[in-house]
């Protein structure tokens, strides 16, 4: 028997200094966790006690945090690379700066193979492209071979910017010719990396032939067994074995996201390669472990250009941006208009012409809007700015609701209206109207939304058992703020990018902002 | 306006030093590598080395490893290359240039170039 | 180290000439490659960069292509001002850089 060591990462979205324990800024050291150097301590320390060992990440290392705003991916290239992965399969996010922001920054930096066999490239690009990502590579750990195959979210055009000469292929049809090639070339362990999620995991576990372990990402799926050390609670038992079409039990992992933990997976293999054991679980990277000395001081190095970036302008206002709670928990404010209008503008993606745009709508709780921006400052926007309209660190995510789902957040909305409460909606591409007179639960009287198959958009009734993608906050698709029928009726769900990113995009493209209120959100008494 | 002005460059008798600067402006040197690039008399250009702009990639062509150390001083937007073991076949002009994309751990292309500074080897 | 390899040496052409230069790489260089012009007692200037980018303030009448082992520099229509030395210069992953030997334009 053969004995190999799987260490792995998913979604670290630009996580490269130590978080708190909800990912979020660290504030208080001793109780921070994650972090590249952190992780490295671990990594090295299991290295050094274990003789065949992999670190494999599964995408999204783009997207987060101020350090991906600032330093467009050539952070992630560094860092990997300072920490010796072996592979990484490349995530949605990766192709958020188009494709020119993976291959300079990233593509061409990486000293590790970066991997997706689903992804065609075709044009001019492929040429370009050719040799800069692999469908598979064969790494040799002590003194056998493993291959390594990548595949990517199908949804990526509707997720990202990669542009029209990529092409996204089922990820089942892709790999299975490649999971072939490995086996004609006499490599009899195979491990899918890849960024599509737990379901999309246990399929490709399930119907790909010579798969013998999954390791995923993009749903930030957190498996344990036991009891887990942190809040995550856990989706299944790490590892996860999926019983395949062939007869065979193949373990699939994720490591929840964020950096918080590295995945740790101990495979057995027999003298054919066949799975025989499989154990393990995340390693929760608390302040227990001590971050690396050398790489926390490359950390601080680059960290001196974020303080400068966060000061610099972005654009104007000539506007007050009204981000008060008297405001924005009670009616429509213009901050939240912005915001929204920044939501939207960021997931322009033309990939059907029977749609001017795959989404049209967006809705924000007000609570999470936490400052308003004086025009009064020169009109000066800065990130610093911004970072107090929106400082949890969250993400605008794409999801699926049905039109009932959406009139029962509305109703949520206002159906404790006029206590300064943050459930209040803030929208994009949505027209509202509240009778407040009517009992909570019943006061929608209203509810049209802009039309996305349409050439020319314009505001139609909502409709109860239609599927539409709306742009949100991650806590309202986690059901925070009290919005638990989001969280339970969601079609899908697909993370996206940092709020503060989003808006400062935005802002930056446009250079002068006057949003206003303009009628979205409006209240009335009496009949309809 | 991006401006790279090198100095230090003379003539110097073989086996001895000699160490030239670039002094940058106009544009933010921190984020970017620095290189230096040399052409003998009548000849074509020789990459001589290359700096990333953390300093942590440091390059050298293989005709001057171990004699030749380059180096930045971010504080005082400043490139340094310090030349020991003069040989004749060092005699050139040396450019002082910029890399192109911020940010990067390896080396691009130069998009800005100083005007050069010669320095011969003779005895 | 990847060797670079440009022809002619010396090309003599005229005025409104469309003319073309070939640097070949001894082994794959994706499209990281760049073209430079020189003339005599200044300093080189950057062209075009990533085989076929234009240079910000290069005339159009620039152009590069090519990827992996050939790439060419063409000048649509050769203007007065072009007469120089033309040097191409590879980029690749984590290798030295190196440059083609030059290729001299003049008068015909």
């Known amino acids: 028997a053969w004995e190999l060591t799987i260490l792995h990462t998913n979604d670290v979205h630009s996580r490269l200094e130590q978080t708190s324990e909800d990912s979020s800024k660290c504030v208080n050291a001793s109780r921070c966790m994650g972090g590249v150097a952190r992780l490295f301590t671990k990594v090295q320390q299991i290295r050094r006690a274990e003789p065949n060992v992999l670190l494999l990440d599964a995408g999204d290392q783009y997207q987060g945090t101020i350090w991906f705003t600032v330093y467009k991916g050539a952070e992630v290239a560094h860092f990997m690379n300072a920490l010796r992965y072996d592979a990484m399969a490349l995530g949605n996010h990766e192709f958020d700066n188009g494709v020119e922001g993976l291959i300079e920054p990233l593509l061409k930096e990486a000293k590790f193979p970066i991997l997706s066999a689903n992804i065609k490239a075709k044009g001019p690009l492929a040429s370009q492209i050719s040799g800069l990502y692999l469908p598979y590579k064969v790494l040799p750990v002590g003194d056998e071979v493993v291959g390594i195959v990548g595949y990517t979210s199908k949804e990526t055009p509707f997720l990202s910017n990669p542009g029209t000469n990529l092409v996204f292929e089922d990820e089942i049809t892709a790999l299975q010719p490649e999971v072939d090639k490995l086996k004609t070339l006499n490599v009899n362990k195979i491990i899918a990396l890849g960024h599509s999620g737990f379901e999309m995991d246990k399929l490709i576990a399930q119907k790909v032939r010579g798969v013998d372990v999954v390791v995923g990402g993009h749903s930030n799926t957190f498996l344990y067994t036991g009891n887990p050390p942190s809040k995550e609670v856990p989706a299944g038992k790490y590892p996860f074995i999926v019983t395949s079409d062939d007869g065979r039990k193949v373990p699939v992992v994720q490591a929840y996201a964020f950096g918080k933990y590295l995945g740790y997976l101990k495979i057995e293999f027999d003298e054919r390669g066949n799975v025989i054991s499989s154990h393990g679980n995340p390693i929760l990277l608390n302040s227990s472990i001590p971050e690396d000395p050398s790489i926390k001081a490359d950390i601080n190095k680059w960290r001196i250009k974020l303080d400068n970036y966060s000061t610099q302008e972005l654009g104007k206002t000539i506007v007050y941006l009204d981000g008060s709670s008297q405001s924005c928990r009670f009616r429509e404010c213009n901050m939240g208009n912005l915001i929204c209008d920044a939501m939207i503008n960021n997931n322009l993606r033309h990939t059907d012409e029977m749609f001017w745009n795959h989404v049209s709508m967006c809705i924000l709780n007000g609570g999470g809007i936490r400052s308003p921006i004086d025009e009064r400052n020169n009109g000066t926007i800065t990130w610093e700015n911004l970072a107090a309209v929106l400082p949890f660190g969250g993400t605008f995510d794409l999801v699926q609701l049905k039109g009932s789902t959406l009139k029962k957040a509305f109703e949520h909305s206002v159906h404790r209206y006029g206590q300064s409460t943050g459930e209040f909606l803030q929208v994009g591409g949505i027209h509202v109207v509240y009778d407040l007179s009517r009992k909570p639960g019943d006061r929608v009287v209203k509810l049209d939304v802009l039309c996305t198959k349409c050439r020319v958009p314009s505001y139609d009734p909502l409709k109860m058992d239609e599927v539409y993608k709306v742009i949100l906050p991650n806590f309202l698709a986690n059901g925070g703020d009290g919005f638990q029928m989001i969280k339970d009726e969601l079609l899908r769900h697909d993370s996206g990018d940092q709020d503060i990113n989003v808006v400062s995009t935005y802002i930056s493209k446009m250079k002068v902002i006057y949003p206003a209120v303009e009628g979205r959100i409006k209240f009335s008494t009496g009949s309809h | 306006e991006v401006q790279l002005v090198e100095s230090g460059g003379g003539l110097v008798q073989p086996g001895r030093s000699l160490r030239l600067s670039c002094a940058a402006s106009?544009?933010?040197?921190?984020?970017?590598?620095m290189h230096w690039v040399r052409q003998a008399p009548g000849k074509g250009l020789e990459w001589v080395s290359g700096?990333?702009?953390?300093?942590?990639?440091?390059g050298y062509a293989d005709s001057v490893k171990g004699r030749f150390t380059i180096s930045r001083d971010n504080a005082k937007n400043s490139l340094y290359l310090q030349m020991n073991s003069l040989r004749a076949e060092d005699t050139a002009f040396y450019y002082c240039?910029?890399?192109?994309?911020?940010?990067?751990?390896?080396?691009?292309?130069?998009?800005?170039w100083g005007q050069g500074t010669l320095v011969t080897v003779s005895s | 180290d990847i060797q670079m390899t440009q022809s002619p040496s010396t090309l003599s052409a005229s005025v409104g000439d469309r003319v073309t230069i070939t640097c070949r790489a001894s082994?794959?260089?994706?499209?990281?490659l760049a073209w430079y012009q020189q003339k005599p007692g200044k300093a080189p200037k950057l062209l075009i960069y990533?085989?076929?980018s234009l240079e910000s303030g290069v005339p159009s009448r620039f152009s590069g292509s090519g990827s992996g082992t050939e790439f060419t520099l063409t000048i649509s229509s050769l203007q007065p001002d072009d007469f120089a030395t033309y040097y191409c210069?590879?980029?690749?992953?984590?290798?030295?850089?190196?440059f083609g030997q030059g290729t001299r334009l003049e008068i015909k």
């Open positions: 240039a910029k890399d192109g994309p911020r940010y990067r751990g390896s080396y691009y292309y130069f998009d800005y």
């Open positions: 106009g544009f933010s040197f921190d984020d970017y590598a």
């Open positions: 700096i990333s702009w953390h300093s942590d990639n440091i």
């Open positions: 082994q794959s260089i994706s499209n990281w």
């Open positions: 990533k085989a076929s």
């Open positions: 210069q590879q980029y690749n992953s984590y290798s030295p850089i190196t």
